[in-house]
């Protein structure tokens, strides 16, 4: 089955600043990524991006840069100033939208004991839901 | 279909606040985003900003900052665009759009004049 | 933020003719990751809304027709209308569809001469 990795790391530059990548693992093709903070996006989640593979990027404050960086993973740069800036246990999601496998979603935050400008390998996150 | 219908146009004065609105149908409003975009007369495209209604996200071009607020009303599939502190250069058409700009709604004219 | 940049601004010309209109960004749209350059055209007609003619730099828009195409990468974009039919004397935009804000160039005038 399809699995979705979400690794978080914080930058060693700017304390408040946070790249947010996650993947797909599975033989789907994308048809669109959403990038959410605290919780899945429509659950309580504030929308940070959204990536058409074709059509474009959208982006919401904080999201300084979303990109993607291979055919099924994306990365997202936040910069963090003011009230709207993520703290250190901010949970992130990532949702994926796949035919025909449908939508597999996944979150992850910043590993306890990381320190600035380290973050753990990415792994699969737990899977949330599958639509 | 898609169908995106905007309300009827309005006339302003400088300093006033217009809210324009945007009813989808056709699709699934929570699922698709809905951008602005305005054109003043005689003039090219100006990208305002986007909302995701799912969420009611909004993200606005830097211009509009502090002066544009859109909102959304998902029990009627409904969009809506304020902006204050109108000025005569704010004169335009003003368009919503969903689906990554492929459908669009037919314009709403914002006069401003004293 | 990104500037779009048409060319020319105005362009007559008569039906059946094959144009080709310019634009150009001050940033690459190309997405290295996937290589894809984010750059759509649309067609705008008097008292009209816009109509999306391309997305993706070259993938037509449903019901577009085949006479329309989009080609180039990086910063540089063209629209190709092979054949130009009477309906298609309009304003043509482009955008930029990578980097916020989202911005569109100034436009070009097709007219008949």
């Known amino acids: 089955t399809p699995e979705v990795w979400v690794q978080v790391r914080m930058e060693a530059t700017e304390l408040s600043s946070f790249t947010i990548r996650c993947g797909f693992l599975g033989s789907g093709s994308i048809s669109l990524v959403t990038v959410s903070w605290g919780g899945p996006n429509g659950a309580g989640g504030t929308t940070l991006a959204v990536l058409h593979p074709e059509r474009g990027i959208r982006q919401w404050a904080p999201a300084r840069q979303a990109r993607w960086e291979t055919q099924s993973s994306i990365s997202l740069i936040l910069e963090g100033s003011g009230a709207s800036s993520p703290c250190a246990n901010t949970t992130f999601c990532c949702k994926f939208a796949s035919f025909p496998e449908g939508s597999w979603e996944a979150c992850g935050s910043l590993p306890p004991s990381s320190d600035p400008g380290l973050s753990a390998p990415p792994t699969p996150a737990p899977i949330l839901r599958a639509d | 279909q898609v169908q995106l219908v905007q309300s009827g146009a309005e006339v302003k004065k400088p300093g006033a606040s217009v809210k324009v609105s945007c009813k989808a149908s056709?699709?699934?409003?929570?699922?698709?985003?809905i951008e602005w975009v305005r054109q003043a007369p005689g003039q090219g495209l100006e990208w305002m900003g986007v909302?995701?209604?799912?969420?009611?996200?909004?993200n606005y071009a830097q211009k509009f900052q502090g002066r544009v607020t859109m909102t959304r009303d998902t029990s009627i599939s409904t969009a809506y665009m304020e902006l204050s502190r109108l000025r005569s250069d704010d004169t335009a058409v003003y368009y919503c759009?969903?689906?990554?700009?492929?459908?669009w709604g037919q314009g709403t004219t914002v006069t401003v004049s004293s | 933020e990104i500037v779009m940049t048409q060319s020319p601004p105005t362009l007559s010309l008569s039906p059946g003719e094959r144009v080709t209109l310019s634009c150009r960004s001050s940033?690459?749209?190309?997405?290295?990751?996937?290589?894809?350059?984010?750059l759509s055209w649309y067609q705008q007609k008097p008292g009209q809304a816009p109509r999306l003619l391309i997305y993706?730099?070259?993938t037509r828009e449903t019901g577009i027709p085949a006479r329309f195409s989009g080609s180039g990468s990086g910063t540089d974009f063209t629209l190709t209308i092979s054949s130009l039919q009477p309906e298609d004397f309009a304003v043509y935009y482009c955008?930029?569809?990578?980097?916020?804000?989202?911005?569109f160039g100034g436009g070009t005038k097709l007219e008949i001469k």
């Open positions: 993706g730099a070259s």
């Open positions: 759009a969903s689906h990554w700009l492929a459908y």
């Open positions: 056709g699709y699934t409003f929570i699922n698709n985003f």
């Open positions: 909302i995701n209604p799912g969420s009611g996200d909004a």
């Open positions: 955008q930029n569809g990578h980097f916020y804000p989202y911005t």
């Open positions: 940033q690459s749209l190309l997405s290295s990751g996937n290589q894809k350059n984010y």
